[in-house]
Interface confidence: medium
């Protein structure tokens, strides 16, 4: 279920799967929700730590268990990823970090009266991730009321500062509050040319636009059918970015499919999740668990419910049923996407629903344990 | 709202307009949504108004100008006002609404979490108010969803300044000493949310006060916690499933 | 927003009858304290009469004692002044009001009508 | 049954003048007086109730105090729109209305 308690002066010991810079405890949790393997996280402020390094360091976790044992640590705060909290997830992040300033790659400097306009001209640049502004009262007099618009490999500062006089924060897009627009549109047989930022394993072009949209550097995609001449490219998805934000070119190319990120859309982005169920596939990766189930609903529900599931394949082979039951094989992979896709099998599969915001299945309170 | 500012989008996406269509339609009251099918608003927002097919609900707005006849709204299924509500009283001022039909979650339009059930240990710093009430006490209904940052007020301290009325534990006060923000005309049923841990909740459902933002003169609210098990039991479905954002 | 609409008054002779009519709407009428008062031209403002929330209590001014009955249906939110008897001192605007008790609310209130003319005169 | 008397019936005054009304009643009646305005061929407006609460969007230079059977209504500076007659309403025991005061340009 939903766990969203913090556990302050607590740290999580081991179990690390990504670590990085985050302004606060909640920005770090939101990161470990969208993070494919992510059920824990800790995180170290300015405060709670001499160690530069370390400050706003932000380490997300994974536990076969579920659990890890927790170690005193004055200051640090620690809690669970928000997977399965129904509408509680979103990478929606709205707050102003006063005295902070978020360093990355500077792109863009602009003069702007507030912190609020400069938020918003990062949220209607298509690459901006984060912004810094140094104030009025800002100690170099040329840099004040200066607007800095930044991006990162990873989309989280490459390091945080303590700084007098200068607000950071992040770009508004995954609100829906972008001024740019997106393109909706699904371009056939078209290949996009630039640079591949990642590339993963879809069972169609929409669960690529998906995993596009909630990738911090991916602009646009390539999407390669289960048909493509190369069979090792098949249900291929290339994330791809460039300097100006649009492909700089595109070629005809049968069996594949490309489109836009939908992080620009205004007033509406698509579910972190992908829903449909795909009759006659088999989605290959890591071994959860197996169990006997009625029906392949009922196989999604369960992978579900199974925090670390992240996909599931459910089998109609005569040897795997036993009268209305039949095996639902949970699985799991490094990047959250199967590890192989293969076609004409007797079963179903799917993905967990656990980052669906719609369901009903999470609670909101918070309880706070101090050790 | 007094001596608030204007929200963005999806900034408070529990916030609905409650509006009535008779001749013309125009904004009454605000609430919160609670659940895909459940509004929390005050039960005074139904006074004389118990008919359910003249109020629309609007979701997943931030400016009532933007208002059309194209304009998705929601019907009412159900008003479901607190049995032990008096208009000649501000006691149990808390009603829920079902929709007719379900709403879909989006990042402009999703509940609020409830607190827990007799929730009094929690110190809450960081406290607004929302709606798109009169800016001055004879003001006009704003276009621009209104929010104001206040802070809540004991209820010892809330009794003093009201002498004439029972300020219970069921209610919650929120203002400053020297007045100047507050909710007003129009705000009622609409959210006092606090934001502890990262996570904002629905601590208090607008209810009265005397005139807006006077001097030593805090907001009155219903306070959320202590009708818990009322929502619970009332939001409950026949398949025993709440049908809302439910506490742990 | 709560109104009171008074309706039925007009010319009537001394010993003649008229009944008056009060649409409520915008508050629930059935909680509430409703009254009658009156205004004689030039003159100030005279309570007449007031009715409980259930309506089984009812209670009048003294020089309208014997041949005013104000009564309420709460099924149709409106309140009622049957004038039987009618004196030429009896000329006056009639308002309708409510009692005004409880907290104050974050909405709007008014508590009259405009008021009905009831002229009694030969 | 109580009865209110006002005073004076009459007062003539002028723009910036402080004015006050008194209003006394019979027995004690507690803090339940209301105050009201009215112009001529409107109906009445309250300005204030329990005494001494203004009404909600009644300008603050209209004050109420008194409890128990001695009342006050005061305009600590009065303005053009302030010419009008003025009541005083009990509400402990039914209602009764006082006789009004006039408050007219000097």
């Known amino acids: 279920g939903c766990l969203t308690q913090l556990y302050e002066n607590a740290f999580f010991r081991g179990g690390d799967v990504a670590s990085m810079y985050t302004p606060n405890a909640q920005y770090c949790q939101m990161r470990c929700t969208f993070h494919p393997r992510c059920l824990l996280f800790s995180f170290l402020p300015a405060s709670s730590i001499n160690d530069m390094e370390k400050r706003f360091g932000c380490f997300l976790k994974d536990s076969v268990t579920g659990t890890l044992p927790k170690v005193h640590r004055t200051g640090a705060v620690s809690g669970h990823s928000l997977k399965q909290c129904g509408h509680q997830i979103s990478a929606c992040h709205r707050d102003i970090y006063k005295g902070v300033d978020m360093r990355g790659v500077n792109f863009n400097v602009s003069k702007v009266s507030s912190v609020e306009e400069c938020q918003k001209r990062c949220t209607s640049n298509i690459r901006c991730q984060f912004f810094s502004y140094a104030t009025q009262t800002f100690h170099k007099a040329e840099y004040r009321n200066n607007c800095l618009l930044k991006y990162s490999p990873g989309g989280t500062p490459t390091a945080i500062k303590v700084l007098s006089n200068v607000e950071s924060g992040f770009s508004l897009k995954p609100c829906a509050l972008s001024e740019i627009g997106c393109h909706m549109n699904i371009f056939q047989h078209l290949a996009f040319s630039d640079v591949d930022v990642a590339r993963v394993l879809t069972p169609d072009a929409f669960v690529c636009r998906t995993i596009c949209t909630y990738h911090p550097n991916c602009l646009f995609f390539t999407f390669y059918t289960n048909v493509w001449k190369i069979e090792s490219q098949r249900n291929v998805c290339l994330l791809k970015t460039s300097e100006s934000g649009t492909p700089s070119s595109s070629t005809p190319q049968e069996n594949t499919i490309s489109g836009y990120s939908l992080l620009t859309c205004k007033r509406t982005l698509p579910e972190p999740c992908h829903s449909k169920i795909y009759p006659g596939v088999d989605f290959g990766g890591e071994e959860l668990n197996v169990t006997f189930v009625k029906g392949v609903n009922v196989c999604q529900e369960t992978c579900t419910k199974m925090i670390r599931c992240q996909f599931f394949t459910y089998s109609l082979l005569p040897e795997d049923c036993k009268e209305e039951k039949c095996k639902c094989f949970l699985r799991l992979s490094m990047d959250g996407s199967p590890t192989r896709i293969a076609y004409g099998t007797q079963g179903s599969s799917g993905y967990s629903l656990r980052l669906c915001n719609t369901g009903d299945n999470s609670v909101c309170t918070t309880k706070t344990s101090t050790r | 709202i007094v001596g608030g500012t204007n929200s963005s989008w999806g900034e408070w996406p529990w916030q609905v307009s409650l509006q009535v269509k008779l001749t013309a339609q125009r904004h009454l009251c605000g609430g919160s949504l609670i659940g895909h099918q459940w509004v929390l608003t005050a039960a005074h927002c139904f006074d004389g108004l118990p008919l359910q097919d003249v109020w629309r609900i609007y979701s997943g707005i931030l400016n009532l100008s933007d208002i059309t006849k194209d304009t998705p709204f929601s019907q009412i299924k159900e008003i479901i006002i607190h049995q032990n509500y008096k208009v000649s009283e501000g006691n149990h001022d808390i009603a829920l609404i079902k929709l007719q039909a379900p709403l879909n979650y989006t990042e402009f339009q999703k509940p609020i979490c409830l607190p827990s059930k007799g929730d009094t240990s929690t110190i809450y710093t960081n406290c607004w108010v929302t709606g798109w009430g009169f800016s001055k006490e004879k003001g006009e209904i704003q276009n621009i969803l209104q929010k104001v940052n206040i802070p809540l007020v004991t209820n010892e301290e809330c009794q003093k300044r009201y002498q004439d009325y029972k300020i219970t534990q069921r209610m919650v006060c929120a203002g400053y000493k020297e007045g100047g923000k507050d909710a007003c005309k129009g705000d009622s049923g609409g959210p006092l949310v606090c934001k502890h841990n990262g996570m904002w909740r629905l601590v208090g459902i607008t209810s009265w006060g005397e005139g807006c933002a006077r001097r030593e003169q805090p907001g009155v609210y219903t306070k959320v916690a202590e009708y818990m098990d009322w929502i619970l039991e009332k939001t409950q479905s026949s398949d025993g499933k709440a049908q809302m954002q439910s506490p742990a | 927003e709560v109104q009171l609409l008074e309706s039925g008054g007009g010319l009537v002779q001394p010993g003649g009858s008229l009944r008056l009519s009060c649409a409520a709407s915008g508050f629930t009428f059935s909680h509430y304290i409703m009254m009658w008062v009156r205004q004689a031209p030039g003159k100030g403002l005279e309570w007449v009469s007031g009715i409980y929330s259930s309506g089984g209590i009812t209670v009048y001014a003294d020089s309208v004692k014997g041949r005013f009955t104000i009564s309420r249906d709460n099924s149709k939110n409106t309140l009622y002044l049957q004038m039987n008897s009618l004196r030429a001192e009896d000329t006056a605007v009639y308002y309708c009001?409510?009692?005004?008790?409880?907290?104050?609310?974050?909405?709007?209130?008014?508590?009259w009508g405009q008021g009905t003319m009831v002229t009694v005169s030969s | 049954d109580i009865q209110m008397t006002q005073s004076p019936s009459t007062l003539s005054a002028s723009v910036g003048d402080r004015v006050t009304i008194t209003c006394r009643a019979s027995q004690s009646i507690s803090s339940w007086l209301a105050w009201y305005q009215q112009k001529p061929g409107k109906a009445p407006n309250l300005l204030i109730y329990k005494a001494s609460t203004l009404e909600s969007g009644v300008p603050s230079r209209f004050s109420g105090s008194g409890s128990g059977t001695e009342f006050t209504l005061t305009i600590s500076s009065l303005q053009p729109d302030d010419f009008a007659t003025y009541y005083c309403q009990q509400y402990n025991t039914y209602w009764t209305f006082g006789q009004g005061t006039k408050v007219e340009i000097k």
């Open positions: 009001a409510y009692q005004r008790t409880g907290v104050p609310r974050r909405d709007s209130f008014n508590i």
